[in-house]
């Protein structure tokens, strides 16, 4: 997160980290209780690795109470999504077991209203992806509230030319923005989950490079079909 | 805790323009969104935009675009909103709002004094 | 844009009474804050995301809701909560409040 600042600590219990080897790579959110939504390409960057999920966690370090690490069960990438395309980039993560709820840990309700956001709708983002250029790691979870930006715009030849598809949406990147290791975390408006984070190798906190984010609400068939 | 404190009241003639600032007490102004909200007689609140000191990015809502502009200064750690062509409509208390918190549901937890406007010939 | 409509407009009960003061919004709004203002002063955050109490307000207040219904709840009205009481939405650009709801105390 650039531009950002330290989350609440737990004020997100829907946060997730998705890890290879007990290491941070995506952000993840938590959808059900047995669910996490995070970013097909993050899966590509895994290679064999074991992956895990991190739920109830603030610092990715320190000992919390509220903190536990799930094997996956399942992992379902989206059928249709490539790894040279940020198109469908979508992962559903079955967990070994159904999460223990609590106050630092619960699902997160998700937009099945397939209406984009206004312009100008202020959301809020988190992770524990790099906090500056120089690719320093934060220990604990950031977040930054970013302007959703209009399609027309992200899809300037400037900007993104053409690549934004309405099963997408763009967010502001002026020095505020999602980066690397925050990819498929949650884009959340209104307290309710928005968008997740895309993994494509985007340079971060540049206006004419602005977010991009999966609107989850274009893919509501797929997840329910997943999770039923 | 940071206080938001507004300009004086202000008496302009109609057609005019007027400039109001917003002065944050603390110096991390440049974190936080500052948003601007007008209220008519009648009690009746509006949301005018916002602006991120941090990097300029503004957002209107349509009723007041083209009436009105916001701006900062941030070695000032300062929010302005200048309001073009008054009428007697735009008579009212403008506030400057702020969330200075960090959680997901944002919310106008800070308020600034209030800037009373009022149009007359 | 999502207009809100409070009622009722005034609103006027005795100490000790149970109150509850209505939100609706012209679409689905998942989460509602809520503001109080008394004469002269700026307005206060009160209740924020639906039913949480903002800090320094009494335990006597709730709020609950979804969809486009939300409610403000005053368990034991006391003479220092007559004031204003606004909601506002925060799910879509641009914001927007409520008219509000003026609490008399009798």
């Known amino acids: 997160i650039l531009g950002g600042r330290e989350a609440e600590a737990h004020a997100r219990p829907y946060m997730a980290s998705v890890q290879v080897n007990g290491e941070h790579l995506c952000g993840g959110v938590l959808v059900a209780e047995q669910w996490v939504l995070s970013a097909a390409h993050c899966l590509e960057d895994a290679a064999d690795g074991k992956v895990q999920v991190l739920l109830g966690a603030h610092s990715l370090s320190q000992p919390e109470p509220s903190k536990r690490l799930y094997d996956v069960l399942r992992a379902v990438p989206h059928p249709d999504s490539r790894p040279d395309t940020i198109d469908h980039d979508l992962l559903l993560l079955q967990l070994s077991e159904k999460a223990t709820l609590g106050p630092a840990v619960r699902p997160l309700p998700w937009q099945r209203v397939d209406r984009d956001v206004e312009p100008g709708t202020l959301c809020d983002v988190a992770g524990w992806g790099i906090v500056s250029h120089a690719g320093r790691r934060p220990d604990r979870l950031q977040h930054v509230l970013l302007p959703v930006l209009d399609r027309a715009t992200c899809n300037r030849r400037t900007h993104h030319d053409g690549a934004i598809t309405q099963r997408m949406m763009c967010a502001e990147s002026n020095r505020r923005d999602s980066c690397k290791g925050d990819s498929g975390g949650p884009l959340v408006c209104g307290g309710v989950l928005e968008g997740v984070v895309t993994s494509g190798s985007r340079v971060c906190g540049n206006r004419k490079k602005p977010g991009i984010y999966t609107r989850v609400a274009s893919y509501a068939a797929w997840i329910d079909s997943v999770l039923a | 805790e940071v206080q938001l404190q507004q300009s004086g009241p202000e008496l302009v003639k109609p057609g005019a323009s007027v400039k109001i600032s917003c002065k944050a007490s603390d110096n991390s102004f440049t974190g936080y969104y500052m948003h601007w909200v007008k209220q008519s007689h009648g009690n009746i609140l509006d949301w005018i935009g916002y602006?991120?000191?941090?990097?300029?990015?503004?957002s209107y809502n349509q009723k007041f675009k083209g009436k009105a502009t916001l701006t900062v200064d941030k070695s000032s750690s300062t929010a302005y909103m200048e309001i073009r062509s008054l009428t007697s409509e735009d008579s009212a208390v403008y506030y400057c709002a702020s969330y200075y918190g960090s959680s997901p549901y944002w919310y106008f937890d800070v308020w600034g004094t209030g800037t009373t406007v009022t149009v007359s010939s | 844009q999502i207009v809100l409509s409070q009622s009722p407009a005034i609103l006027s009960a005795s100490p000790g009474e149970k109150v509850t003061m209505t939100c609706r919004a012209s679409?689905?709004?998942?989460?509602m804050h809520w503001y109080q203002q008394k004469p002269g002063s700026s307005p206060k955050p009160w209740i924020y995301a639906t039913s949480n109490l903002a800090s320094g307000v009494p335990a006597r207040f709730s709020g609950s809701g979804s969809g486009t219904s939300h409610f403000l709840t005053i368990s034991r009205l006391e003479a220092e909560d007559a004031a204003t009481y606004f909601c506002?939405?925060?799910?879509?650009?641009?914001?927007?409040f409520g008219g509000g709801t003026k609490l008399e105390i009798k």
């Open positions: 679409s689905s709004v998942s989460y």
């Open positions: 506002q939405q925060w799910s879509s650009n641009p914001y927007t």
């Open positions: 602006i991120d000191p941090y990097n300029g990015v503004s």
